[in-house]
């Protein structure tokens, strides 16, 4: 009896694992084995596919074959007993195009109100993703074990920290990788669960803000308790994208080590141009807090977001305010590459009631003022870009008296 060739061959590639599956054509024939050949593009000869010769099952693994994953290959299969079937040719394919990203490896660390997730590719030193290893991004689904309500977090890198969690609570999550450059979405990791710790005695510092004063950066934060010491550390933001070895070498800001106030001042030249992450930790001598949430700090934005400089022309019932570029030391104006909006606060000198104007223009009219009255004005700049969302500190207040009545022209 003639052997029928196998049908419906499927090629599954996950990371560097190459698996072939097929259907027997004739279930009634026993003791049949199967063998594959492969052919590279531009070659006429067929080569025996190692790992897939004389297979008794309907599955084989040819991961040991060192293929160029970007080169098209063709496969063929036949059944063998005393005689052999005809060859069945599989559609040609390029391994890289066909490959799926496998489940990533996930390690979790717990704090009282945060979880740190360390993610690395499931296959170490993968041949398939050798040129794309730095391009992996990840997404995750996280839920409270008790509730099952899922939250999705997209576009994260090899280390991600989730804040604002509850102490002594079990959270579960699963992670998948993506190569956006190749339109590839991976397979989810197994579910990993971790319980957050008991609430720490000392909470982390909150509401960290950076501003510029003279040639210095001023870093401020809020803290619940008095008589604490604080330390501040920085890290190049790009290192978060680099899967590297999961060791992030946070560095001390020398002027912000063991400070006793909820702010510290350090020279602008501590940082070269770039984007940094900053974090703050509190200690009372016996206990140490977990680190604060990390804030992004862009020297370019911070440097240019000085408080605006303005001139006031006083009329009887209004002020005309002309906003100019802030001056650096040496009286040179700061070049502003970002669109800004201006917040102008004014009040009667004898009163605390402040009024506010928000304006995109650099010439602003403050209306409805009383004649011969001293009003004070201060202003600050905001970036219009939601992602950057930065504000300068307020300028010093400037106080002027309005003119007598009937000088509004």
């Amino acid at each position: 009896k003639n052997l029928k060739s196998p049908q419906k061959v499927e090629v599954d590639i996950i990371d560097d694992n190459f698996i072939l599956r097929w259907n027997r054509s004739d279930e009634s024939v026993g003791n049949v084995t199967f063998s594959f050949d492969y052919q590279k593009t531009g070659m006429d000869n067929w080569i025996k596919l190692s790992g897939c010769q004389n297979i008794t099952s309907t599955k084989c693994n040819f991961s040991s074959l060192k293929l160029n994953v970007y080169e098209e290959i063709k496969l063929r299969i036949r059944a063998e007993k005393e005689n052999t079937s005809s060859w069945y040719e599989v559609d040609s394919f390029t391994p890289f195009r066909k490959a799926q990203i496998g489940p990533p490896e996930v390690h979790l660390e717990a704090e009282d109100k945060a979880i740190v997730i360390h993610i690395s590719p499931g296959t170490k030193d993968s041949v398939m993703w050798a040129l794309d290893g730095l391009s992996f991004t990840y997404s995750l689904v996280i839920w409270k074990n008790s509730s099952g309500v899922e939250e999705r977090i997209e576009n994260i890198y090899s280390r991600h920290k989730i804040y604002k969690l509850s102490p002594e609570t079990t959270y579960c999550l699963k992670v998948k990788a993506a190569l956006l450059t190749s339109w590839k979405i991976g397979v989810y990791s197994p579910v990993h669960c971790i319980k957050t710790t008991v609430e720490n005695e000392l909470p982390p510092p909150e509401n960290i803000e950076v501003s510029v004063q003279n040639q210095n950066y001023v870093l401020k934060w809020d803290y619940t308790y008095a008589n604490m010491t604080f330390q501040v550390q920085w890290l190049h933001a790009f290192l978060k994208r680099n899967p590297g070895n999961h060791l992030y070498k946070w560095k001390q800001i020398p002027d912000c080590e063991n400070v006793k106030t909820t702010q510290c001042v350090f020279p602008q030249n501590v940082f070269q141009k770039g984007i940094y992450l900053l974090r703050v930790q509190a200690s009372d001598g016996n206990n140490t807090s977990f680190w604060s949430e990390e804030i992004k700090f862009d020297t370019e934005i911070q440097a240019f977001l000085l408080p605006p400089v303005f001139n006031i022309r006083s009329l009887s019932d209004s002020f005309h305010i002309y906003i100019g570029a802030p001056k650096q030391s040496g009286n040179t104006p700061v070049i502003q590459d970002y669109p800004l909006i201006y917040e102008i606060i004014f009040w009667e000198n004898t009163s605390n009631a402040e009024r506010k104007i928000i304006e995109k223009k650099t010439d602003v009219t403050v209306p409805n003022l009383k004649p011969l009255t001293v009003y004070c004005v201060k202003a600050r700049a905001h970036t219009m870009d939601e992602k950057l969302n930065k504000s300068s500190v307020f300028s010093d207040a400037v106080c002027e008296k309005t003119k007598p009545g009937n000088t509004s022209k």
Epitope: T197, G244, N245, L247, K249, N287
Partner: antibody, heavy 118, light 107 residues
């Protein structure tokens, strides 16, 4: 494979200094921290400090501050720990270890016995 | 400094027994705890990092658990090669510290 190989045993007089070396292979020393831990005979482990070989930033345990100096020469993948004003209770085994973030101290040197005796 | 206490300080056991060693820290260290095994005249051998993850090559009979201030190392079925001293280690904040050790010997 990853290895940390330390210099050989030393005998020193009280008041002298000792410099122990730790040669790294199988990894780039600049990408990690090198920690130093010591152990007195029959006693537990005691953390001394660490160095970032990339920029020579150090952290020392308060107990050794002022007496210990950690340095590194990245061109020969070697870290050093120098302890000055030696006393008899510095007769211990000194270990270097690689620190790998949340993987902690994942590789250790074989140890260097320093004997302080007059 | 973060103080670490380990109990028991020594433990006599037999091959096949299940053994649990506990470690307490004087403050919350999250999950920043590692465990090391040391035999006489040898360097410490890493067993567990980040409270519960085994280093590659470490047998599955070793497991770690806990968080915050209370941590545990368990050997599910003690083997002859497991008789040694075990140390816990916190790497949450400087200065890093070790527990005083637990000596496991043959009953």
């Amino acid at each position: 494979q990853v290895q940390l190989v330390q210099s050989g045993a030393e005998v020193k007089k009280p008041g002298a200094s000792v410099k122990v070396s730790c040669k790294a292979s199988g990894f780039n020393i600049k990408d990690y921290y090198i920690h130093w831990v010591r152990q007195a005979p029959g006693q537990g482990l005691e953390w001394m400090g660490r160095i970032d070989p990339e920029d020579a930033e150090t952290k020392y345990a308060p107990k050794f501050q002022g007496r210990v100096t950690m340095t590194a020469d990245t061109s020969i993948s070697t870290a050093y720990m120098e302890l000055s004003r030696l006393r008899s209770d510095d007769t211990v085994v000194y270990y270097c270890a690689r620190y790998h973030g949340y993987w902690a101290l994942d590789y250790w040197g074989q140890g260097t016995l320093v004997t302080v005796s007059s | 400094d973060i103080q670490m206490t380990q109990s028991p300080s020594s433990l006599s056991t037999s091959v096949g027994d299940r053994v649990t060693i506990t470690c307490k820290t004087s403050q919350n260290v999250g999950t920043n705890v590692a465990w090391y095994q040391q035999k006489p005249g040898k360097a410490p051998k890493p067993l567990i990092y980040s409270t519960s993850y085994r280093y590659s090559g470490v047998p599955s009979r070793f497991s770690g658990s806990g968080s915050g201030t209370d941590f545990t190392l368990t050997i599910s079925s003690v083997q002859p090669e497991d008789f040694a001293t075990y140390y816990c280690h916190q790497y949450f904040s400087y200065p890093y510290t070790f527990g005083p050790g637990t000596k496991l010997d043959i009953k």
